[in-house]
Interface confidence: low
Amino acid sequence: KNLKSPQKVEVDIIDDNFILRWNRSDESVGNVTFSFDYQKTGMDNWIKLSGCQNITSTKCNFSSLKLNVYEEIKLRIRAEKENTSSWYEVDSFTPFRKAQIGPPEVHLEAEDKAIVIHISPPGQDGNMWALEKPSFSYTIRIWQKSSSDKKTINSTYYVEKIPELLPETTYCLEVKAIHPSLKKHSNYSPVHCIKTTVENELPPPENIEVSVQNQNYVLKWDYTYANMTFQVQWLHAFLKRNPGNHLYKWKQIPDCENVKTTQCVFPQNVFQKGIYLLRVQASDGNNTSFWSEEIKFDTEIQAFLLPPVFNIRSLSDSFHIYIGAPKQSGNTPVIQDYPLIYEIIFWENTSNAERKIIEKKTDVTVPNLKPLTVYCVKARAHTMDEKLNKSSVFSDAVCEKTKPGNTSK
């Protein structure tokens, strides 16, 4: 009896797992085995597909085959008993295009009021997503085990800290991976649950802020108790986006090791241009707090947010204010690549009534002034970036007298 070739072959690819499924054509024939060949683009010859030879079931795994995932391949299958069926050819496909993203692996660490999530990207050590790992983002769903109220958090980092949780409370979470440009996403990972620890005697430092003074960065934070020592660590922000870098190291800022105040000062040249993460930890000699929430610190924005420098041209009924780049020491202007908004406050010298102008331009007219009157002006800069919402301190006030009448031309 002639064997019929199998039909309806399906190729399932999840990360680097390649699975083939098919239907038997002739259920009545026992002891039938199935074998696959494959063919790469531009090749005439067919090659036996290892892992899929003489298979008795209707499923096989060819993950061990080291394929170029960007290269189109073709498969064919036949049934074998004493004789063989004709080959059935499967539509050619490109593994990378066909592949689905598998759920990420998740490892949890508990703090008293936070959970640290370590995410291993899909296809951890495989070829399929080897070049795509920096492009993944993650959706984290978290809920108290005793409640069904789920909170969703989006992250581009491989290590994410979820703060503002309750001590000694069990939280559950699941994570899915998303690749926006490929328009693919995984299913959610299995649910992981963890109980936060008993409340630490020492809370973490809060409200960390960085400012610039002269050639130094000044890092300040708030803390509940006195007589503490603090340490500050930094990390390149991009290292937390780099999945190959689970072993990234937070580094100490030497000038901020074991400081006894709630601030530390370190030279601006400690950091090259770039975006960094900073965190602070408190200790009383016996106990140590958990690390504070990490703050994002952009050296460029930080440098730009020195207060603006401005000149005033006085007319009888208005001031023309020309805003320039702030000066560093050595009188060199700071180059500004970021769009800024300027807030200008002015008032009559003899009055406390302040008026405000918000302006994107660097030349600003302050209208409706009285002639021969002394007005004072101060200004500050704000970034227009919502994610890095920063403001400079106000400049020193500059006071000028308006001209006599009829000099507005």
């Epitope: 390149h236 190959g244 072993l247 190291k249 580094k251 100490q252 800022i253 030497p254 040249n269 400690v270 950091f271 090259q272 241009k273 770039g274």
Partner: antibody, heavy 123, light 107 residues
Framework: QVQLQQPGTELVKPGSPVKLSCKAS????????LNWVQQRPGRGLEWIGK????????RYNQKFKDKATLTVDKSSNTAYIQLSSLTSEDSAVYYC????????????????WGQGTSVTVSS | DIQMTQSSSSFSVSLGDRLTITCKAS??????LAWFQQKPGNAPRLLIS???SLETGVPSRFSGSGSRKDYTLSISSLQTEDVATYYC?????????FGSGTKLEIK
């Protein structure tokens, strides 16, 4: 002044390993990454990897992961590279070079180089 | 890995010439680019880091420029001692990678 001292030459038999040294002076050894770079005869430069002498954290070029092992001895300010199972393909000059600072210049350039050790693999 | 492509493998030049060597990265490297000079039998010497910063002791006739993926090393007036091979290298992303080198020869 900053110096990285390397022995001039090593003659090795095929299949044998070799351990090359790089002695640092003139700076705080544990404050800068230490890189290793290969240059085969008449060819360009290839980065092998780097080690943080303060805690022996290593970043390898995957191409050399099975070939090279980086270590340091902090007490003598010396970095080492061990090359295993040598073949003629491993005949090259191996340079050590100081990299960016561990704290201040994390991804800095390789500013000081040793003179290189010429490894010849021959029976 | 990030590929670094140097435009020419060799240049035949005259003393006093102005010379430009270009280097293109396969992805953005945020100015983490170094230029090295290597003479036969010697170790590479760092000329420029951060794409534009001239190292101490390097003559001012050397300069670096560029951003994102495209970078340039310029020598304003070529001297005899500048005859060497020049390499660019990115140190933005591990593994650090070098260009294939540009060799200068005197006409």
């Amino acid at each position: 002044q900053v110096q990285l001292q390397q022995p001039g030459t090593e003659l090795v038999k095929p299949g044998s390993p070799v351990k090359l040294s790089c002695k640092a002076s003139g700076y705080t050894f544990t404050s800068f990454w230490l890189n290793w770079v290969q240059q085969r005869p008449g060819r360009g430069l290839e980065w092998i990897g780097k080690i943080d002498p303060s805690d022996s954290e290593i970043r390898y070029n995957q191409k050399f992961k099975d070939k090279a092992t980086l270590t340091v001895d902090k007490s003598s300010n010396t970095a080492y590279i061990q090359l295993s199972s040598l073949t003629s393909e491993d005949s090259a000059v191996y340079y050590c070079a100081r990299g960016g600072g561990i704290y201040y210049d994390y991804d800095g350039a390789m500013d000081y180089w040793g003179q290189g050790t010429s490894v010849t693999v021959s029976s | 890995d990030i590929q670094m492509t140097q435009s020419s493998s060799s240049f035949s030049v005259s003393l006093g010439d102005r010379l430009t060597i270009t280097c293109k990265a396969s992805e953005v490297i945020y100015n983490r680019l170094a230029w090295f000079q290597q003479k036969p039998g010697n170790a590479p010497r760092l000329l420029i880091s951060g794409a534009t910063s001239l190292e101490t002791g390097v003559p001012s006739r050397f300069s670096g420029s560029g951003s994102r993926k495209d970078y340039t090393l310029s020598i304003s007036s070529l001297q005899t001692e500048d005859v060497a091979t020049y390499y660019c290298q990115q140190y933005w992303s591990s593994p650090f990678t070098f260009g294939s080198g540009t060799k200068l020869e005197i006409k």
